[in-house]
């Protein structure tokens, strides 16, 4: 085959190599861009930054390699379109820093940076951290800082993230109101704030306010969907980033549905009760308090993480005659109590007869109104009660 | 697999007291009653008690209930009991079982308890 | 307290031999659970919920009864079958056991 004239030559299915001396300046309108998989990229000294913009549209790459050439600056976001990025070899190049930003969200399995003029900051202490913990292929390069020696022994005591502290209200938050929330920003160098509320939607009305060092944050009329919502601060400096989520819990009252009996393996009274704080809960049945044991009791499903409410079962492993009844569900906190009753009938009771069947003995009734929750029978103090034990 | 382990044999004298551990593994500890059963020897069994971790939640039998305690270390996924005011009719071998939807599951290897003076 | 009262409380027999050893409750219970002993060891669950057999048990066991009266049923006696037998009701505080059936070895 005749030798690639272009500045760019097609290299297996999806690969291309850009060779040729001084032929790049910028990554813009390669040719069959969409479905690259490798760019490599050499002498190209004209080539001295790369940003967004360069890889846009390179959405499957997945090795690149840029070596021996002019590269100076790689933008924090270069690589935000090319996601799948795995090996990052740049190699050779004029770079002084790169930022930990810019490989935050990559997978990568190697990055390789020996041979650039590193100048040993805080902004390398990630790169250091990787080097210390084996990651991405570094610790093989024995990377050295352009006339200070290895990164390795770069002093770090100082390079730390921002440090952040989020002051909540400590008295009770009610429904309607409004809360201030502020967060103080700590550290060196520090470069960007904001808060992350995307958990919020209807929950309150949002007012942001301030800057660095100290973000404020109104949240007003405040509605009981705030609860267990995560409202974030964040910052970031040349080290990284930090993120510090609080939450505010409104209070309001309790409150209780209850649901069929279903089997399930045995049978389940569902229940769902709210409230903040978390209610205290009481079962009744027949109105008198239903103590519980291993074989009625209550059990919650796994709560989710981000609602109050929580869901469960009064469990009922053997349920007979015995357990028919009204089951009643009492939930109180100090904002409120609430409460939910349900007829269950988990079997027919082998003692009761059609009134019309020629059957001329009376049977003993079954008190279900037993105080202490336990199934009870008790024969009937009348005369002429006949006991039957039907087997 | 479910394992409940116990601890080992204990000798006591007439008027101590003994605490029995229960350490599971292999299931969700909270989500289990615990049991505790003894056996005298070349008796029946006789139920003591039960707990639910979850809630700590505890049912005793009348007969011990001024004498037995019944705790749990969810931490550890471990089950306690201790008897009191130990008597000689108390030697026995104590058993932990756990339930949920269906009785005494599984069962501990058992503890031997020896009272006397 | 529920009482559990089993027949016979001991009981010799040969292998191959259909066995059935019975349980009455002093009231009504909804359902029995049945435990096997041998010597030395821990009680194993055979039969709950009356006659469902628990995991790993032969279907020569067997269970039923209703109301006070249950019954554990072993179809064709095995050699490792020789152990105390035990009720147990699961319907009221405190849970009771029956004072074991003793199945021997003729």
């Known amino acids: 085959a005749a030798p690639c004239p272009d500045a760019c030559c097609p290299h297996g299915s999806s690969g291309l190599r850009c060779t040729r001396d001084g032929a790049l300046d910028s990554l813009h309108h390669l040719p069959g861009a969409e479905n690259l998989t490798e760019l490599y990229i050499e002498n190209q000294q004209h080539l001295q930054h790369l940003e967004l913009r360069d890889l846009r549209g390179l959405g499957e790459l997945r090795n690149l390699t840029i070596v021996k050439s002019g590269l100076r600056f790689v933008a924090p976001d270069a690589f935000h379109f090319t996601p799948r990025l795995s090996r990052l070899n740049l190699s050779f190049n004029a770079l002084e820093s790169l930022s930990w930003k810019t490989v935050q969200g990559l997978s990568l399995q190697e990055l390789v940076l020996s041979g650039n003029p590193l100048h040993c900051s805080c902004a390398l202490r990630w790169l250091q951290r990787w080097e210390e913990e084996g990651l991405g292929g570094v610790p093989e390069q024995k990377l050295q800082c352009h006339g200070q020696g290895p990164l390795a022994h770069m002093p770090n005591a100082s390079c730390g993230v921002p440090t952040l502290k989020v002051q909540v209200p400590n008295a009770s938050v009610d429904v309607g109101d409004d809360v201030l929330l502020r967060c103080q920003v700590e550290g060196r160098g520090l470069e960007q704030a904001g808060w992350i509320l995307t958990e919020l939607e209807q929950s309150a009305t949002v007012m942001k306010s301030g800057g660095l060092p100290s973000l404020g944050l109104t949240l007003a009329n405040v509605t009981s969907d705030l609860n267990r919502k995560n409202v974030t601060c964040w910052a970031e400096n040349d080290v990284g980033r930090a993120e510090v989520s609080v939450q505010v819990n409104v209070s309001f009252p309790a409150s209780v549905q209850l649901h069929t009996a279903v089997e399930m393996h045995h049978w389940c009274i569902p229940f769902s009760v709210d409230g903040q704080p978390a209610p205290s809960l009481r079962w009744l049945f027949n109105g008198s308090v239903l103590n519980e044991t291993s074989f009625i009791f209550t059990e919650f499903l796994e709560p989710a993480a981000n609602e109050t409410v929580r869901h469960g079962c009064l469990r009922l492993n053997q349920p007979t005659h015995v357990n028919n009844g009204n089951y009643t569900l009492l939930a109180a906190n100090p904002f409120g109590q609430a409460s939910a009753s349900i007829m269950a009938a988990f079997m027919d009771n082998p003692f009761e007869f059609n009134p019309e069947d020629p059957i001329p003995v009376s049977f003993s009734p079954v008190d279900t109104n037993s105080t202490s929750g336990d199934p009870v029978e008790k024969k009937d103090e009348t005369p002429f009660g006949v006991s039957v034990a039907v087997g | 697999q479910v394992q409940l382990v116990q601890s080992g044999a204990e000798v006591k004298k007439p008027g101590a007291s003994v605490k029995v551990s229960c350490k599971s593994s292999g299931y969700t500890f909270t989500n289990y009653w615990m049991h505790w059963v003894r056996q005298a020897p070349g008796q029946g069994l006789e139920w003591m008690g039960e707990?639910?971790?979850?809630?700590?939640?505890?049912n005793y039998n009348e007969k011990f209930k001024n004498r037995v305690t019944m705790t749990v270390d969810i931490s550890i996924s471990t089950a306690y009991m201790e008897l009191s005011r130990l008597r000689s009719d108390d030697t026995a071998v104590y058993y932990c079982a756990r339930s949920r939807y269906d009785p005494m599951e599984d069962w501990g290897q058992g503890t031997t308890v020896t009272v006397s003076s | 307290d529920v009482q559990l009262t089993q027949s016979p409380s001991s009981l010799s027999a040969s292998v191959g031999d259909r066995v059935t050893i019975t349980c009455s409750a002093s009231s009504s219970v909804g359902y029995m659970h049945w435990y096997q002993q041998k010597p030395g060891k821990a009680p194993k669950r055979l039969i709950y919920d009356t006659s469902k057999l628990a995991s790993g048990v032969p279907s020569r066991f067997s269970g039923s009864g209703s109301g006070t009266d249950y019954t554990l049923t072993i179809s064709s006696l095995q050699p490792e079958d020789f152990a105390t037998y035990f009720c147990?009701?699961?319907?009221?505080?405190?849970?009771?056991f029956g004072q074991g059936t003793r199945l021997e070895i003729k």
């Open positions: 707990i639910y971790p979850n809630q700590g939640r505890v």
């Open positions: 147990q009701q699961w319907s009221s505080i405190p849970l009771t």
